[in-house]
């Protein structure tokens, strides 16, 4: 019986056995015209499979039934009889092994093991014709017949509606004449399905429904060409915006041709002096795979202006699964030097072209949407960089993303685009020859853009020296080196072996920079990450100081100060993180302006007051300044003749 | 730049929303059995059956006829009263089980969950494209009907499936029944069967051949009875049905019986396991 | 009162075909099964076959399948028999009965008076 | 074809006597069997349907019975113009047909 693997479906549903057409015959291997037993199952009573479909069809050819039943026959009657082998079917006779009769012990010599009704030991298995496309579809009736050579199923759901759907087990989806609702109820399809002539008679809850076999109509195709790929059977035509059946637009059906029709075209607009490439996208282009275009059969207008067919690049040939469909067509735009700034339409008219198969492609297809647009470049920073080449430049103006293509070119050497938008490119500078001043241009579309822009190549920065060897995030790190101005902005980046920060250094002097730590977020709050860092000057080469680590911020206390005892001359408070980035980053500690020579211990900070502070009545200010950024943490004080302590 | 066009999903060159108005009949209750016939000088029909009553419509779906089932019991109940004076059993409202077209008459045959689920026979007239029903003949003879052997009771109000083939000159109905317990003691419907009409449209002729779920199997073990159909030589009823007498009777699985569609006994009875997957 | 009046006495030729005909009265026409009966002289019934005139249905004895049609005509309430390529062995007299309450086959209760047939060279 | 064989082929009563035709079929038909009157150069004429139903304007001395194989038709009290031809006939299968009949002569 073939497939053992897969999801059981045991459950009939519903069935129907019908003659087959000839295409799902040979998928079958049978001949023509042949009966075969359709049914639609479901995993349980309930319909509700684990995963998988709700429903799905499997197909048995009587002949191949009724072979399976005959062999079965054989193996219980013919000798050798496998020992063991059950007649079956306990439920209405007495069990028995084969060849006995029902109840016999053995056959008498006037009984036959023929003669006595019988349960086929082997079952005949079969795979879902639909390969699970049903999805969740609950098919309730079914009734299969065959058009042309078309086998087609006609299915009743449980939520009201009628599938007619070509019986084909080849196809990744399934091929509809149609999907649709009987009515508003939503009431399950009734199982039994009757014939009557050209029509089915379907039944749903109170209701009796007649439907064509050949569908209901052609309304649900929504384009010319798939209306007219639809089965002969269908009687369906194209009635100039929409598809129906003759006796619906007598006047202007017709089953002949298509228009090409224009879904999108990329890109949306172009520089009114320069070139184009032009995609595009739509339908009823050309009907050909390879997309080979006869001559003079495509004529494609902007505006006034001609669009010159290009062949298609056989690289960007994609497959297209047969379930998708989309045409590309690439033409060359020259506008015309008659040709306006503004919006415009892009024109597609296919005429002259050799006839499909199911229909040739004749008409014309307008999609507006395109501008003509001149591109004006007003600003570009910096004008200079490093000799390497790599510093970031920024042009600024309008209509710069227009068109297919551009280039900034930085002495006839073309500046590598990052970003490109509507007012504003991106590109990273080629490497200078020389230390210079050279031409900079930027052409759209291959015309060049008004404007005259120099640009100026300096000597490398050259870093020497990275300090200190750790931080945290904004701490500062100070850069040492030659020409460090050379650059528009030195980068400072940390790397912990997974991933990289990096920070911009604010320009300063040729040999000395002070720049800030990158945001980096430190996990573990008592710990710290190792990690290279690293500083370079756009292209020139970089310096990377190695076993950097990277701390945990530290934390000021935020609760006011405990007054001092009078036996007391030294101020004692918590700063969580301080002690740890102590050789990281300066640290003063102020007590009404006078320093005070701070210990450590773990998280406390130890402050001796300085012999020479004298604390008012309103007491002094403690300040601790952090790597220059100054925080007041409260005053001290000493309690009052009352006890009462003083402080703010 | 390569810019490539977006796909377009097969399923946009169709919508599946569009709203189609096919003709239709509202049969005043739920449909329980719909059969349609053809004729061979351009008549045609479709027998729409619910609670009670049988619709006759024409070929466009306009009603034509339409004759009460039920209850029976009642007065009002016209295939009833061609079983002659009653009563003819318990009262009650008639769900129709079967309905099927006997091709050698051509006739219509109704049966009912009620009256012991006997069938009637209604002449097919033709007038112009649309049929009529003739007045019912009452396919039971009292006389050769009890409740342990009643060739005349057909239908199951558990459902049943019925197929008619013509051998020779005489019309045999083969029938399937689901059966239970309660069902099975009632005027003892079978599981399969295979009943020939009389001539003279009295009955079924009794000696019928069947097969039956074992009394001990009753409880536990039933058969549903989804499709029946006549192809070749053979008749096949398509079952759902525990796929073991001793294990878990909710354990289930499809078969396929075969029955000789030329000879009318049960001798070659075959049933065979169909098994169906979904391989992703 | 149901009466079923036949054509009268044929003499006919061997080979050649004969029609009689049997118009009823006194009840509704379509609603009955008309069958046809043959009795050799001096012989038993022999049953040919019926008609429904109300959906002219009809069946025969594998016998006289070839050799009888049936047919109706619903307008003058008259049903026919045409009898093909005769031969002496047809020489009998043919009666045209309606099915009394129960169809198709069941027992015969009105019968017309016979129209004897003669083939004879 | 089931063959219904009507014994005996003639029967010769007196008036008044009580007379029973038989009908055996070749195989079981339930109760669809019916007699028939022939009177010479008549049509036939119902008697009984069914093996022992009754058909109005029948005189009450006819009476049938049996079932499956074995039926009989009895005149309980013979009158003169009983004097005719009786067939059977089985409405069980197709074709319908009739035995070979039975004479009624009156001595």
């Known amino acids: 019986g073939a497939p053992e693997g897969g999801q059981p479906y045991p459950v009939l549903r519903v069935a129907h056995s019908a003659p087959v057409g000839a295409q799902l015959a040979t998928e079958l291997s049978i001949a023509e015209g042949q009966e075969v037993l359709f049914g639609v199952f479901v995993t349980g009573k309930d319909g509700g499979p684990g995963v998988g479909p709700n429903s799905v069809v499997c197909a048995f050819p009587i002949d191949l039934l009724d072979t399976l039943i005959d062999e079965g026959v054989e193996r219980c009657c013919e000798s050798p009889v496998h020992p063991g082998l059950r007649r079956g079917l306990d439920f209405f006779q007495s069990p028995s092994f084969c060849p006995n009769p029902p109840g016999l012990e053995a056959l008498s010599p006037n009984t036959s093991c023929r003669h006595f009704p019988l349960l086929v030991s082997s079952s005949f298995s079969r795979v879902d014709l639909f390969n699970g496309l049903l999805g969740p579809v609950q098919v309730t009736a079914l009734y299969v017949t065959r058009l042309d050579n078309v086998t087609v199923a006609h299915m009743g759901t449980m939520d009201g509606r009628i599938l007619q759907v070509e019986l084909v087990r080849s196809l990744n989806y399934l091929l509809y004449v149609s999907n649709f609702s009987l009515g508003d109820s939503g009431q399950p399809v009734q199982r039994d399905v009757s014939r009557l002539g050209d029509h089915l008679l379907f039944a749903s809850g109170d209701q009796v429904f007649q439907v064509p076999i050949q569908g209901p109509g052609c309304r649900h195709f929504l384009t010319c060409g798939r209306c007219l790929r639809a089965w002969h059977f269908m009687g369906c035509g194209w009635c100039g915006n929409m598809c129906g059946q003759q006796k619906e637009c007598p006047g202007s059906w017709q089953q002949d041709h298509c228009p090409p029709k224009l879904t999108e075209f990329h890109p949306h607009s172009g520089p009114l002096r320069g070139s184009t490439r032009l995609t595009l996208c739509g339908s009823n282009f050309y009907l050909h795979p390879s997309g080979l275009v006869p001559e003079g059969t495509h004529q494609v207008t902007v505006g006034q202006s001609p669009c010159r067919p290009l062949p298609k690049d056989s690289s960007k040939l994609r497959p297209v699964p047969r379930k998708d469909f989309v045409e590309e067509f690439e033409c060359e735009l020259e506008p015309l030097g008659t040709q306006a700034v503004g919006p415009t339409n892009v024109s597609l008219t296919v005429t002259n072209m050799p006839p499909g198969k199911h229909f040739r492609v004749d008409g014309t297809s307008v999609l507006r949407g395109f501008s003509f647009m001149e591109p004006v470049l007003i600003a570009v920073q910096p004008l200079f960089g490093p000799r390497a080449g790599g510093t970031c430049l920024t042009l600024e103006g309008q209509s710069l993303s227009v068109g297919t293509s551009r280039a900034v070119l930085v002495n006839g050497t073309e500046c590598l685009l990052a970003r490109v938008s509507e007012g504003q490119l991106l590109c990273a500078t080629p490497p200078g020859a020389t230390v210079a001043s050279v031409p900079l241009s930027l052409q759209v579309g291959g015309a060049q853009v008004p404007g005259s822009w120099t640009f100026q190549y300096r000597e490398d920065p050259v870093v020497l020296s990275i300090s200190p060897n750790c931080g945290y995030i904004n701490s500062h790190i100070t850069i040492c080196g030659q020409h460090l101005t050379s650059a528009w902005h030195l980068v400072l980046s940390f790397h912990d072996g997974l991933r990289a920060v990096e920070s911009r250094c604010e320009r300063q002097l040729p040999e000395q920079q002070l720049c800030r730590l990158p945001e980096y977020v430190v996990r573990d709050p008592q710990g710290w990450v190792a990690g290279n860092l690293s500083a370079r000057g756009d292209g020139a080469a970089g310096f990377t100081l190695p076993g950097f680590r990277f701390l945990p911020p530290p934390h000021p206390p935020s609760a006011n100060l405990v007054p001092l005892k009078p036996e007391e001359h030294a101020i004692k408070f918590e700063y969580i993180g301080l002690g740890a980035v102590a050789d990281c980053v300066g640290i003063n500690v102020t007590v009404g302006g006078e320093s005070c020579q701070h210990e450590f211990r773990g998280d406390m900070v130890v402050c001796p007051l300085p012999p020479s502070l004298q604390l008012g009545q309103d007491g002094a200010p403690l300040q601790v300044c952090v790597d220059g950024e100054c925080h007041i943490l409260g005053r001290v004080v000493r309690p009052g003749p009352d006890g009462v302590p003083q402080s703010t | 730049e390569d810019w490539q066009c977006p796909r377009t999903p097969y399923a946009a060159s169709r919508d599946f929303d569009v709203k189609y108005v096919v003709p239709s009949f509202s049969a005043g209750g739920l449909v329980q059995a719909m059969v349609t016939y053809e004729g061979d000088r351009n008549e045609s029909a479709v027998f729409v059956a619910i609670r009670n009553r049988l619709h006759v419509l024409g070929p466009d779906l306009k009603s034509v006829q339409s004759l009460a089932t039920g209850p029976a019991g009642d007065p009002g109940c016209q295939t009833c009263a061609a079983c002659g004076p009653g009563p003819h059993g318990p009262p009650g409202d008639t769900d129709t089980k079967v309905l099927v077209l006997d091709p050698a008459l051509p006739a219509l045959v109704s049966c009912g969950s009620s009256l012991q689920g006997r069938c009637f026979l209604h002449d097919l007239e033709p007038q112009g494209t649309a049929v009529h029903l003739a007045a019912p003949a009452c396919l039971f003879s009292a006389h050769h009907n009890r409740p342990d052997d009643c060739p005349d009771c057909v239908a199951s109000p558990l459902g049943t499936r019925v197929t008619v083939v013509e051998q020779g000159q005489a019309s045999y109905f083969y029938v399937a029944s689901s059966l239970d317990a309660a069902v099975a003691a009632s005027f003892s419907p079978r599981s399969v069967s295979i009943r020939r009409l009389k001539a003279d449209a009295s009955g079924f002729a009794p000696g019928f051949v069947a097969l039956s779920v074992l009394p001990k199997h009753l409880v536990s073990y039933s058969i549903e009875y989804v499709h029946s159909f006549h192809t070749g030589a053979f008749v096949y009823f398509l079952t759902v049905q525990p796929a073991s007498v001793t294990d878990d009777p909710s354990a289930l699985h499809t078969r396929l019986a075969r029955l000789s569609a030329t000879e009318p006994e049960l001798g070659d009875y075959r049933e065979l396991v169909l098994d169906c997957r979904f391989a992703p | 009162e149901v009466q079923l009046q036949e054509s009268g006495p044929e003499l006919v030729k061997p080979g050649t075909s004969v029609r009689i005909s049997c118009k009823a009265s006194?009840?509704?026409?379509?609603?009955?099964?008309m069958h046809w009966v043959k009795q050799r002289p001096g012989q038993g019934l022999e049953w040919i076959g019926y008609i429904y005139p109300g959906n002219v249905n009809t069946k025969y004895n594998e016998k006289f399948k070839g050799k009888a049609t049936l047919t109706a005509d619903k307008s003058s309430s008259t049903a026919y028999m045409q009898l093909s390529s005769l031969t002496s062995e047809d020489s009998a007299v043919y009666f045209c009965?309606?099915?009394?309450?129960?169809?198709?086959?069941?027992?015969?209760?009105?019968w017309g008076q016979g129209t004897a047939v003669t083939v004879s060279s | 074809d089931i063959v219904l064989t009507q014994t005996p082929a003639i029967l010769s009563v007196s008036p008044g006597e009580r007379v029973s035709f038989s009908c055996r079929a070749s195989?079981?038909?339930?109760?669809?069997i019916h007699w028939y009157q022939q009177r010479t150069n008549g049509s036939p004429r119902l008697l009984i349907k069914y093996a022992s139903e009754s058909i109005s304007g029948i005189p009450s001395r006819f009476s049938g019975s049996g079932s499956g194989t074995d039926f009989t038709l009895r005149i309980n009290s013979v009158e003169s113009e009983d004097l005719a031809d009786y067939y059977c006939q089985q409405s069980d299968s197709w074709p319908t047909t009739f035995g070979g009949g039975t004479k009624l002569e009156i001595k």
């Open positions: 009965a309606r099915l009394g309450y129960y169809r198709y086959g069941g027992a015969m209760d009105y």
């Open positions: 195989q079981s038909i339930g109760t669809s």
């Open positions: 006194g009840y509704t026409f379509t609603s009955y099964y």
